[in-house]
């Protein structure tokens, strides 16, 4: 099966590598414009140059191109406590992360957040925080794991999952309620 | 006590328009970044749309993008979501939340609306 190709890359198929058709005359290979520069006028006949302009600022084409209008440059979004790693510039769009001791959590593809690392007090680090993952911790003895902090198994309520963990505890917890102290 | 109270949902043709509201109390909402998502019938949560406290900055996922529109009134401590255009796939459960500080789960979420796209 041939995959199904748009009808710009069927254009641009026929002509050879760096190199797109006129949309108005398709005997025309002209040649595509750099990155950091868009389409401001097609070639007007064969071998002759493209007429390409260079990005206006807060704009940017990251690779060769033959678009009419260089793509607007992103903003780091400070509610989701992001901060610019790098700015835009005609080539390269800008470039947003988090602060030191902090990791990537994505909502979605190109939607991501903020979060501190865990320090995994009451346990040990079992995988250390990484770009875009959280600390792993592991909870010592008479801890359980929520929401990836370790929480004294007094905090462990019958109906949660922690009743496996915590289950000497828990039994210490009832057996002290059962004995009827006067 | 932290409540979010969703409302505006309903069954609604295709192509059609909703206006989603959610009714905040418990919490100082001028201060707080709301967010909206929904959960498909089957499926995960949804990031749909946030904005920031003032109502300055935005954003919209790919599939709702030039369809709905969000907006905040913070003298009335409630957040909208304007749905056009819908279409069968937009049919989920509409939550509002707060946007999470501590880590990647919702402590504030409301119970939702439910909205159905069908003809």
């Known amino acids: 099966l041939v995959p199904h190709l748009g009808d710009r890359e069927k254009r641009d198929s026929v002509c050879p590598q760096g190199k797109y058709i006129h949309p108005q005359n398709n005997s025309i290979c002209c040649t595509k414009c750099h990155k950091g520069t868009y389409l401001y006028n097609d070639c007007p006949g064969p071998g002759q140059d493209t007429d390409c302009r260079e990005c206006e600022s807060g704009s940017f084409t990251a690779s060769e191109n033959h678009l009419r209008h260089c793509l607007s440059c992103s903003k780091c979004r400070k509610e989701m406590g992001q901060v610019e790693i790098s700015s835009c510039t005609v080539d390269r769009d800008t470039v947003c992360g988090c602060r030191k001791n902090q990791y990537r959590h994505y909502w979605s593809e190109n939607l991501f957040q903020c979060f501190n690392c865990s320090l995994c007090l009451n346990g040990t680090v079992h995988l250390s925080c990484q770009e875009k993952q959280n600390t792993v911790c592991t909870c010592h003895a008479g801890f359980f794991l929520r929401e990836n902090e370790c929480v004294s198994c007094s905090n462990c309520k019958k109906s949660l999952e922690c009743t496996k963990l915590c289950l000497p505890q828990i039994e210490n917890v009832k057996g002290t309620e059962d004995s009827g102290t006067t | 006590e932290v409540q979010l109270l969703e409302s505006g949902g309903g069954l609604i043709q295709p192509g059609g328009s909703l206006r989603l509201s959610c009714a905040a109390s418990?919490?100082?909402?001028?201060?707080?970044?709301m967010v909206w998502v929904r959960q498909a019938p089957g499926k995960g949560l949804e990031w749909v749309s946030h904005i920031d406290r003032v109502g300055q900055d935005t954003y919209y996922a790919d599939p709702v993008k030039g369809r709905f529109t969000i907006s905040r009134d913070n003298s009335r401590n409630t957040l909208y979501l304007q749905m056009n255009s819908l279409r069968a796939e937009d049919t989920a459960v509409y939550y509002c939340?707060?946007?999470?500080?501590?880590?990647?789960?919702?402590?504030?979420r409301g119970q939702g609306t439910l909205v159905t796209v069908s003809s």
């Open positions: 939340a707060v946007l999470p500080k501590r880590g990647p789960w919702f402590d504030y």
């Open positions: 418990g919490f100082t909402f001028a201060h707080e970044t």
